[in-house]
Amino acid sequence: RKIPKVGHTFFQKPESCPPVPEGSMKLDTGIINENQRVSMSRNIESRSTSPWNYTVTWDPNRYPSEVVQAQCKHLGCINAQGKEDISMNSVPIQQETLVLRRKHQGCSVSFQLEKVLVTVGCTCVTPVVHHVQ
Amino acid sequence: RKIPKVGHTFFQKPESCPPVPEGSMKLDTGIINENQRVSMSRNIESRSTSPWNYTVTWDPNRYPSEVVQAQCKHLGCINAQGKEDISMNSVPIQQETLVLRRKHQGCSVSFQLEKVLVTVGCTCVTPVVHHVQ
């Protein structure tokens, strides 16, 4: 899923208010829902018919510093016999997400949102192309 | 995948610099990689053996304003004959993501990051529990 462009008005104050300095806004440091509990998956990446591996990228000037990317293990899907069936396809499920980028210039620190494309997992699909060559 | 808590030091300046005002930082309004191209999938939500629907939630004080949630259509998975097979399970693939929350207090506008749990799609898994009732 793709994040649309940020609208021109999103960072603006109401019309009746004095304009804000061009280019920067106030970011509160707390994070809403930071402690929300997430149901941990029960190894779905290995039990899936379109299994995947994870790779971790790390950047100390990004929040979250750790971004996890999935890679589909197979071209096809795993059948009931545990064999790869290439009449079906493993395909990545991708999601555009936001991260916060920290920027230093001497003692000046500012932050900026950054779009990152994350592959979250894989699913098994019927191929579109059914040619016989 | 779960986003870890933001570290205490992430919003701090280097030790040799004067401290920043408690609670808020400077957010640049541009978005890095805003124009990155995303390969659009070809209806994988309907072609998957664990197909899903999408529901859109809208909030004008959030960026992105539109957050799309997937719901698995079936308990089981779709077999080669196009029938639901409940010896396999459709399960959601979830991703914690960040959104930017806009907060108004009169003419004062500030922003805060918020964690949102997004169901991105579904995958077909072999069940762990194999009871016969």
């Epitope: 149901s39 | 719901q71 259509k73 079936h74 308990l75 399970n89 762990v128 009871h131």
Partner: nanobody, 123 residues
Amino acid sequence: EVQLVESGGGLVQAGGSLRLSCAASGRTFSSYVVGWFRQAPGKEREFIGAISGSGDSIYYAVSEKDRFTISRDNGKNTLYLQMSSLKAEDTAVYYCTADQEFGYLRFGRSEYWGQGTQVTVSS
């Protein structure tokens, strides 16, 4: 995290109908398979049926297929169980349950359970 609260139980005459509701709190209700179990006095907990996240797929235990109807309203974060032609043997505590996998839910291994609502059918 999901909290489940059942309601709608009570005393009903044999042959009557009842609709149970299960209100879920939590932002991702639609990502869960949800279903119903019941436990009669002195008996094991019994699976009634379940419904997929979108509501497109419903599975019933064979014995209840004709008299019980499961539905959900994701906009209201609510699961329903419509029961008709009730019999004395339907007397039980009815539990709502949620999990991201049908395989876990079906065999009573769900991650989330409600406290239950008592249904008593008098003959």
